[in-house]
């Protein structure tokens, strides 16, 4: 039960995390205009990975896409790549983890296969989360560097009365969404990996003794009732032999009125 809960919770947390990574990647507010030196501006600038926007106080917002690929900073390209890799890995991880969920039965899939799939999806979520955190952190570092560079030459035209105030950018909402989402995906991945340990069959084989009653060919199977109910959580790690040496899962794989899908 605890394993199923851990796996399910890991899946849900990762799902929220990946949705957050997608949202952060699409958001325009990766960097927003720093208003410390000019809190009374009637024009507000903010930038995303894909376009930059200007919001006028009058309510009009104008966004322009970065239609060049070669003209963009290498760091921005790297951040884009990291976020996309994170999304792709996360999406694949989600797909794999759906089939790995213990509460979902697909054909005659063994616990060992589900355990492997859970581990695979967990690793994918961890890498996805790390990609998102790395991407956001690289962008944040870029912002901090540019912020202090522009502060060093805040006023580019101090000659006489005329002042040209350079626009400085600070952390936008997307960065925080990205950090949180990356963290959630990472946590979800770790939970999936923990759940995998509980799903993996133990090495020890416990052999059941068959008692053949005269005139009847009925095999006594320890935990057999639980196997038939579809709730065999206590016996899931025991291999029960029944003449043909089938595992409990194989016995269960034939649907009965007691099977819950």
């Amino acid at each position: 039960m605890a394993v199923t809960a851990c796996q399910g919770l890991g899946f849900v947390v990762s799902l929220i995390g990946i949705a957050g990574i997608i949202a952060a990647t699409c958001m325009d507010q990766w960097s927003t205009q720093d208003l410390y030196n000019n809190p009374v501006t009637a024009v507000f600038n903010y930038q995303g990975l894909w376009r930059s926007c200007v919001r006028e106080s009058s309510g009009f917002t104008e966004c322009r896409g970065y239609f060049t690929l070669l003209g963009l900073p290498a760091m921005l390209q790297a951040v884009r790549a990291l976020m996309i890799v994170g999304i792709v890995l996360g999406a694949i991880g989600l797909l794999v983890s759906i089939f790995a969920l213990k509460c979902i039965r697909i054909g005659s899939m063994e616990d060992s296969a589900k355990a492997n799939m859970t581990l695979t999806s967990g690793i994918m979520f961890i890498v996805s989360g790390l990609c998102a955190i790395a991407g956001v952190s690289v962008f944040a570092n870029m912002l901090v560097t540019n912020f202090w560079m522009s502060t060093a030459n805040m006023y580019t035209g101090m000659g006489g009365m005329v002042q040209t105030v350079q626009t400085r950018y600070t952390f936008g909402a997307a960065l925080f969404v990205g950090w949180v989402a990356g963290g959630l995906t990472l946590i979800g991945g770790v939970m999936m990996c923990i759940a995998c340990r509980g799903l993996a069959p133990e090495e020890t084989n416990y052999k059941a003794v068959s008692y053949h009653a005269s005139g009847h060919s009925v095999a006594y199977k320890p935990g057999g009732f639980k196997a038939s109910t579809g709730f065999g959580s206590n016996t899931k790690n025991k291999k029960i032999y029944d003449g043909g040496a089938r595992t409990e899962d194989e016995v269960q794989s034939y649907p009965s009125k007691h099977d819950y899908v």
Partner: antibody
């Protein structure tokens, strides 16, 4: 089409509060801002302040302690209150809608307010 | 506050001639985000409210004749009337729309010579 019309008393006594109303039609009060601008007789334009679509306000630094701009969306009205008026506040008061580039694209006809005892 | 300085205070130009009005701001009105200058030009005829002519320093408002054009960037701006018509007699104002307070220039009175 967009229309703005200022209304209020034409005469205000010194030290009293000047109250004007701008009734608008043809645009959404929650989407666009409205500025108040005044023009003393024979002089240039002076921006007083603005209330934006989201309800936030900005005022001229020289008037900030005396001015309040508000709006009543249900009545499609904007109001200007200027306290402790003096003869220097005698002017034609205009309300104007803010558009692209924060420019004032539609103006009311204006109302003359005289401050005199 | 940004100070807007217009020159000349008054200007007399013959009909059909070019009229040029200058406006200088104490700070740059160029927004780096969209590379647009937040400067607006208005025309005010006697007894009337001002009328928007040009915003973003060079974008003509719809319905404004194409003889009116705006130019300039940063702190120096110009309104040009390529061929003066009798109906262009008015006072012209520039306005900073970049930073609060949204200050106006002192105005330039345009007359016919």
């Amino acid at each position: 089409q967009v229309q703005l019309q200022e209304s209020g008393p034409g005469l205000v006594k010194p030290s009293e509060t000047l109250s004007l109303t701008c009734t608008v039609s043809g645009f959404s009060l929650t989407s666009y801002g409205v500025s108040w601008v005044r023009q003393p007789p024979g002089k240039g334009l002076e921006w007083i302040g603005v209330i934006w679509g989201d309800g936030s306000t900005n005022y001229h630094s020289t008037l900030i302690s005396r001015v309040t701009i508000s709006k009543d969306t249900s009545k499609s009205q904007f109001s200007l209150k200027l306290s402790s008026v003096t003869a220097a506040d005698t002017a034609v008061y205009y309300c104007a809608k803010a558009g692209r580039g924060n420019a004032l694209d539609y103006w009311g006809q204006g109302t003359l307010v005289t401050v005199s005892s | 506050d940004i100070v807007m300085t217009q020159s000349p205070d008054s200007l007399a130009v013959s009909l059909g001639e070019r009229a040029t009005i200058n406006c200088k701001s104490s700070q740059s009105l160029l927004n780096s985000g969209n590379q647009k200058n937040y400067l607006t030009w208005y025309q005010q005829k006697p007894g009337q409210p001002p009328k928007l002519l040009i915003y973003w320093a060079s974008t003509r408002e719809s319905g404004v004749p194409d003889r009116f054009s705006g130019s300039g960037s940063g702190t120096d701006f110009t309104l040009t009337i390529s061929s003066l018509q009798a109906e262009d007699v008015a006072v012209y104002y520039c306005q900073n729309d970049y930073s609060f307070p949204l200050t106006f220039g002192g105005g330039t009175k345009l007359e016919i010579k």
